[in-house]
Interface confidence: medium
């Protein structure tokens, strides 16, 4: 399986909400011996490998923000901890999983990584990640709502988190 980032860059005004999204695609084993662990963290663009370093998002670690389930099941963080920090991660039946960040500030700007670990009990763990940039802007040059730039082309799309 692979992870695709629908958008490689999100540009948002301060105070807005944004939902960063990744999608798991390719063959997904739905056997009872296979589970998926999905999470989010901040990182930096390393010289060797992007998303290698794991930094917290608003003081919450990747462990705090994880989802854990079998196959393409729906799940979401119900952690009070995450919600108190204006964060919520979620996963749907179609392989999409996301993190919603509320009331963005300039400090939220940076590189965000989604991580998926496929756990085949007794055999192996296979992990893949996706990366995307979030730019939070303020002042007259800031957009009125979030603009997302697709990974594959330069056409932008206006998005607003619910």
């Amino acid at each position: 399986f692979k992870v695709a980032t629908l958008y490689s860059l999100y540009v948002c005004p301060e105070g807005q909400n944004v939902t960063l999204t990744c999608r798991v695609f390719g063959p997904v084993d739905k056997g009872h011996d296979v589970t998926f662990y999905k999470t989010w963290y901040r990182s930096s663009r390393g010289e060797v490998q992007t998303c290698s370093e794991r930094r917290p998002i608003r003081n919450l670690t990747f462990q705090d923000l994880h989802l854990h389930h079998g196959g393409h099941q729906a799940a979401n963080t119900s952690h009070d901890l995450a919600q108190r920090h204006g964060l919520e991660s979620a996963s749907d039946h179609h392989g999409n999983f996301s993190i919603t960040m509320r009331n963005l500030t300039l400090l939220d700007s940076g590189l965000y990584c989604c991580l998926v670990v496929e756990i085949r009990h007794h055999h192996s763990e296979h992990r893949v990640h996706g990366a995307m940039e979030l730019q939070v802007q303020t002042g007259k040059d800031a957009p009125s709502s979030c603009v997302a730039y697709p990974s594959s082309s330069q056409e932008s799309e206006n998005i607003t988190a619910a």
């Epitope: 011996d33 589970t35 662990y37 060797v48 290698s52 370093e53 794991r54 990747f62 462990q63 705090d64 994880h66 854990h68 079998g70 952690h79 991580l115 670990v117 756990i119 009990h121 007794h122 055999h123 192996s124 763990e125 992990r127």
Partner: antibody, heavy 118, light 106 residues
Framework: EVQLQQSGPELVKPGASMKISCKAS????????MNWVKQSHGKNLEWIGL????????SYNQKFKGKATLTVDKSSSTAYMELLSLTSEDSAVYYC???????????WGQGTSVTVSS | QIVLTQSPAIMSASPGEKVTMTCSAS?????MFWYQQKPGSSPRLLIY???NLASGVPLRFSGSGSGTSYSLTISRMEAEDAATYYC?????????FGSGTKLEIK
């Protein structure tokens, strides 16, 4: 604060069985695997196996199959390792450690010393 | 199973000296992890995913490598770094540790 509190030292007779506990606190128990590691003579570390409190799934090092049995009690956030048919070779310090998937064992218990002697 | 061979088994260094130890895997692994253990204490995570410092680890520690060859470096040895260091792989079951490198202070 993340803590893994293991049960105290044990002196057991050859052929007996025993159970070590590891009580977790300060984190979401089901978001991690609980791993067990053996350290003999203060030297080599050996991974015994893991259990996922999320679904009870276990994975064992083949070397320890039949020797160790891993269980969890989600209600008390406690992991257990039962050691069976003990011999002098099983004398060691045993550690529990939490591990997030795709990561490392970032918190360890203080260790439980097991001495097998008649 | 993947066998991890650490060298040297024992080494000593003076304060301020640069220290490098290696970990060789019998077959290729995706990432290496390093732990530090002092006598009477539990192992402590130092480095994850080959080159990233775990929380609270001093910047004088660094890790590098790929495939079957990995290393841990301490840029300037300090007395508190005297310990045994273990490498570990999570790439395939059973997860294995190296035999350790004991680092002593001169």
């Amino acid at each position: 604060e993340v803590q893994l509190q293991q049960s105290g030292p044990e002196l057991v007779k050859p052929g007996a069985s025993m159970k070590i506990s590891c009580k977790a606190s300060g984190f979401s128990f089901t978001g991690y695997t609980m791993n067990w590691v053996k350290q003999s003579h203060g030297k080599n570390l050996e991974w015994i196996g893991l259990i996922s409190p999320y679904n009870g799934g276990t994975s064992y090092n083949q070397k320890f199959k039949g020797k160790a049995t891993l269980t969890v009690d989600k209600s008390s956030s406690t992991a257990y390792m039962e050691l069976l048919s003990l011999t002098s070779e099983d004398s060691a310090v045993y550690y529990c450690a939490r591990r997030a998937y795709g990561y490392a064992m970032d918190y360890w218990g203080q260790g439980t010393s097991v001495t097998v002697s008649s | 199973q993947i066998v991890l061979t650490q060298s040297p088994a024992i080494m000593s260094a003076s304060p301020g000296e640069k220290v490098t130890m290696t970990c060789s895997a019998s077959s290729s692994v995706s990432y290496m992890f390093w732990y530090q253990q002092k006598p009477g204490s539990s192992p402590r995570l130092l480095i994850y995913d080959t080159s990233n410092l775990a929380s609270g680890v001093p910047l004088r520690f660094s890790g590098s490598g790929s495939g079957t060859s990995y290393s841990l470096t301490i840029s300037r040895m300090e007395a508190e770094d005297a310990a045994t260091y273990y490498c570990q792989q999570w790439s395939s079951y059973p997860f294995t540790f190296g035999s350790g490198t004991k680092l002593e202070i001169k």
